[in-house]
Amino acid sequence: AWELTILHTNDVHSRLEQTSEDSSKCVNASRCMGGVARLFTKVQQIRRAEPNVLLLDAGDQYQGTIWFTVYKGAEVAHFMNALRYDAMALGNHEFDNGVEGLIEPLLKEAKFPILSANIKAKGPLASQISGLYLPYKVLPVGDEVVGIVGYTSKETPFLSNPGTNLVFEDEITALQPEVDKLKTLNVNKIIALGHSGFEMDKLIAQKVRGVDVVVGGHSNTFLYTGNPPSKEVPAGKYPFIVTSDDGRKVPVVQAYAFGKYLGYLKIEFDERGNVISSHGNPILLNSSIPEDPSIKADINKWRIKLDNYSTQELGKTIVYLDGSSQSCRFRECNMGNLICDAMINNNLRHTDEMFWNHVSMCILNGGGIRSPIDERNNGTITWENLAAVLPFGGTFDLVQLKGSTLKKAFEHSVHRYGQSTGEFLQVGGIHVVYDLSRKPGDRVVKLDVLCTKCRVPSYDPLKMDEVYKVILPNFLANGGDGFQMIKDELLRHDSGDQDINVVSTYISKMKVIYPAVEGRIKFSTGSH
């Protein structure tokens, strides 16, 4: 038998420095977790102790903190090279800065193969990107070889900016011929490494003949066998075993997100490349693991530019940006409008001639807006200012919800109106009218939403049975501020871009902003 140790990360999202337990900014270092310096310590420890080790990443290194905003992927290549990753799969966020923003900082600089079998380049891009990412790679490990085949969410055109010259094929359809090719090359140990979410990971394990192990990402799935070491609740055992259509037991793993854990899977293969056994668990990268001093010193060196960036002007406002709780938790506030407009702007994807855009709606809990910005400081808006408005390091995500769920969410928005609670919703692409004289749960008297399948956008009444796309903070998608109905009833959830980055990009693009209060949220009494 031959034993392989697979170390894996996914959805690191720019968490190069250690973070707090909830993956936000590290405040108390003695209780912080993750970061590449700590990850390196653990990886090196395992490499020294075990003979056949692969370090893999399942995508979405890009996007999530000021590190990505400033360095635009150069930081990913540099520190993944330093950690000596063996392979990476492309995630949807790797396309956030367009194809050029992937090619230059990452594909050209990585000293490891970057993989995706279901992304096919066409037109002028085909020759430009040829060889810079691969469908699969055969890696020598000890005296054996292991085939790694990559895949990426086919929803990427709706989630990021891959442009028109990349075609995202069905994962299973694209993977099978590549796996077959590996088999003809006498590679009998094959790992599918990719970024399409846990449900697709399980389908790949079930349907793609010849795949021995699936290492996934995108859904931030936490798997664990036994007593979990932190706050994350396991979605299943680690590894999650899927019985393939041809009767094999295929281990499927994922390692939550944000570099908080290092996935650790030990696989035993027989001489014909069949998996005999698999076991392991994600390793919590807490402060009991020291940060590697040389990587830490490198991080500190790279940090200097970030500190300078946060005080530079992004754009100007010529109006007061009212992000006060007195406004944003009680009525439409122009800071809420600004943020929602930025959220929609960040998700403009003209992927279908029938639609002016795939999404038109935004909701945002007023309690998530933590500060105003005064225009009397020469109108200057900096990253630092925005960090005071949006201090939680969240993301603005894309969900699909039924109209009935949205109606419940808006009822929840005002179910205890007047107590300065955070659940009061700010909106974009929505006109809502509340009647507070009615009883809680029956206060939404009008709810109109901006059409998407139209050439001239206009507001139509919400249809209860229709499925709508909505941009919202990950906090709401996860049921925060009591929006349990969103968490329980959402039909799809894709994580998006860092909140501050979305707003800063919008302000930089607009240069001068003047958001108004314009009647998105209204109150009526009695007859309407």
């Epitope: 230059e104 020759s127 060889g131 810079l132």
Partner: antibody
């Protein structure tokens, strides 16, 4: 297949400059960095610098800083290395090499430069 | 700059022999080491990058191992076309630096 064809041998006087070309074929020129390396008689190989053909970004060995200039003509899929203020110790074979995964991987056939008064 | 020390500087062997060449870096270069072959009057030909990954078309009798500061190139069964000079280079950090070479001759 990847081919890097370099210009012919040069004989130069001390103090002069030399410009060596490297024409790439068999791949998309702008997609890969190009290294320049030299091999002087009886000396170990020396890395001179590299260039990103898509944006002209360069990195140079400090030993040659100020004397070496690496450029590209993307329309001709050609990289150039110019070395100025030549001295006798610059007599060497100069190679271009395509960079893959960080490393020089595919090499040109070499250009002999002789510096002699 | 990182110094690369190769040993031996020359060695004699016969067809079918197993041959090992070593390369030592003056500091940790992770796994970012390339081995290449050069025949007299010819361009270098890269064989292995990142310590142990063979470039396309390189015969499987060539293999590499090591990490950190100590690295090895092994030719499991020498063929007549393998007699040449072998070099290592590190690309962990700039400037890229080279070993002094190992001349492999027919015994």
């Amino acid at each position: 297949q990847v081919q890097l064809v370099q210009s012919g041998a040069e004989v130069k006087k001390p103090g002069a400059s030399v410009k060596v070309s490297c024409k790439a074929s068999g791949y998309t020129f702008t997609s890969y960095w190009m290294h320049w390396v030299r091999q002087a008689p009886g000396q170990r190989l020396e890395w001179m610098g590299n260039i990103n053909p898509s944006n002209g970004g360069t990195k140079y060995n400090e030993k040659f800083q100020g004397r070496v200039t690496i450029t590209v003509d993307t329309s001709a899929s050609t990289a150039y290395m110019e070395l100025s203020s030549l001295r006798s110790e610059d007599t060497a074979v100069y190679y271009c090499a395509r960079r893959d995964y960080g490393s020089p991987s595919y090499w040109g056939q070499g250009t002999t430069v002789t510096v002699s008064s | 700059d990182i110094q690369m020390t190769q040993s031996p500087s020359s060695l004699s062997a016969s067809v079918g022999d197993r041959v090992t060449i070593t390369c030592r870096a003056s500091q940790d270069i992770n796994s970012y080491l390339t081995w290449f072959q050069q025949k007299p009057g010819k361009a270098p030909k890269s064989l292995i990058y990142r310590t142990n990954i063979l470039l396309d078309g390189v015969p499987s009798r060539f293999s590499g191992s090591g990490s950190g500061t100590d690295f090895t190139l092994t030719i499991s069964s020498l063929q007549p076309e393998d007699f040449a000079t072998y070099y290592c280079l590190q690309y962990h950090e700039f400037p890229v630096t080279f070993g002094g070479g190992t001349k492999l001759e027919i015994k």
